[in-house]
Interface confidence: low
């Protein structure tokens, strides 16, 4: 018969012959022949291959370097790479999470719109009229101004985006 020019899924062409690919988690030891099947071996500890393959070496698991603020989020297996994330209080500098930086705080006058995660920084928003933040924080939202009316008081000092209103007693009726 004519030698194949293309092979089925999960096969590869070598020496005019279709050989089976190695399954995920295994590497190629020797190609198939006319008489023998492809020989594969499992990846070693701290190695992986995540596809059907003909690789002769497994890939090393990613190293989550603590010197860069990284820690393991999900331990790698023979079929998956290790997933790194950042220590608490830090977030990844890129999608690949190769290093971390500290979360930023929102300055007074700004509140936290979205708390930082292992992969995204704090998102701040300016406090709108009626709200304030007097602290630098990575967690605090803008707080609403105190409602003097509900306390039977009047506004003595207007609030800003950084300060609460100051309430005081109502003026007594003059005689």
């Amino acid at each position: 018969p004519e030698p194949p020019t293309a092979c089925r899924e999960k096969q590869y062409l070598i020496n005019s012959q279709c050989c089976s690919l190695c399954q995920p988690g295994q590497k190629l030891v020797s190609d198939c022949t006319e008489f023998t099947e492809t020989e594969c071996l499992p990846c070693g500890e701290s190695e992986f291959l995540d596809t059907w393959n003909r690789e002769t070496h497994c890939h090393q698991h990613k190293y989550c370097d603590p010197n860069l603020g990284l820690r393991v989020q999900q331990k790698g297996t023979s079929e998956t790479d290790t997933i790194c994330t950042c220590e608490e209080g830090w977030h990844c500098t890129s999608e690949a999470c190769e290093s971390c930086v500290l979360h930023r705080s929102c300055s007074p006058g700004f509140g936290v719109k979205q708390i930082a995660t292992g992969v995204s920084d704090t998102i701040c928003e300016p406090c709108p009229v009626g709200f304030f933040s007097n602290v630098s924080s990575a967690f605090e939202k803008c707080h609403p101004w105190t409602s003097c009316e509900t306390k039977d008081l009047v506004v003595q000092q207007a609030g800003t985006n950084k300060t609460d209103v100051v309430c005081g007693p109502q003026d007594r009726l003059r005689a």
Partner: antibody, heavy 115, light 112 residues
């Protein structure tokens, strides 16, 4: 190369204030926290706390709340340890160390408090 | 606070021999993320401490492979094979799993 260089030795009287500096070089200062560690003469190491140079936010161990203040000057890549109202028991060598995980240390600043 | 105990204040050793230094914690140092945050430092006479081992068994950059760390939970060991004169100093373990971080009292390595 990465270096943490601390200010020189200090001799102070009880009740005075001291400010020790730790100048970082060779890396992005705001990307790493800075720890402070105390070592009394002939004693072991005691973690005082750390400061987040990105936000300026300090974290203090309970024994170092009150008279102790961490601060940073990011433009100078420098962390500071200030101790107010000095006491004899503050006599020690103070180290700054990068976080995580204490991989680089300053050479230490010796503080002597004596009347 | 987590108490770190280094029972042996000092260990004498002959150059070329191996030595083990132990450290116990009053609470497990296993973090919920699966890592165990135990560090080993060496402070040579008159010098700053230097990191040797992080997360129980990982050798810090530039540290000779004569140093190795092992253990889990609350019991940890630093082993130095083929001790050299430059290894003298005080060895400290430290937990980094919760505030406040705490050091052991130190074990002094002395050459016989």
């Amino acid at each position: 190369q990465i270096q943490l260089v601390q200010s020189g030795p200090e001799l102070k009287k009880p009740g005075e204030t001291v400010k020790i500096s730790c100048k970082a070089s060779g890396y992005t200062f705001t990307n790493y926290g800075m720890n402070w560690v105390k070592q009394a003469p002939g004693k072991g190491l005691k973690w005082m706390g750390w400061i987040n140079p990105y936000t300026g936010e300090p974290t203090y161990a309970d024994d170092f709340k009150g008279r102790f203040a961490f601060s940073v000057e990011t433009s100078a890549s420098t962390a500071y340890l200030q101790i107010n109202n000095l006491k004899n028991e503050d006599t020690a060598t103070y180290f700054c160390a990068r976080k995580p995980p204490f991989d680089y240390w300053g050479q230490g600043t010796t503080l002597t408090v004596s009347s | 606070d987590i108490v770190m105990t280094q029972a042996a204040p000092s260990v004498p050793v002959t150059p070329g021999e191996s030595v083990s230094i132990s450290c116990r914690s009053s609470k497990s140092l296993l973090h919920s993320n699966g890592n165990t945050y135990l560090y080993w430092f060496l402070q040579r006479p008159g010098q700053s401490p230097q990191i040797l081992i992080y997360r129980v068994s990982n050798l810090a950059s530039g540290v000779p492979d004569r140093f190795s760390g092992s253990g889990s939970g609350t019991a940890f060991t630093l082993r130095i094979s083929r001790v050299e004169a430059e290894d003298v100093g005080v060895y400290y373990c430290m937990q980094h799993v919760e505030y406040p971080f705490t050091f052991g009292s130190g074990t002094k390595l002395e050459i016989k």
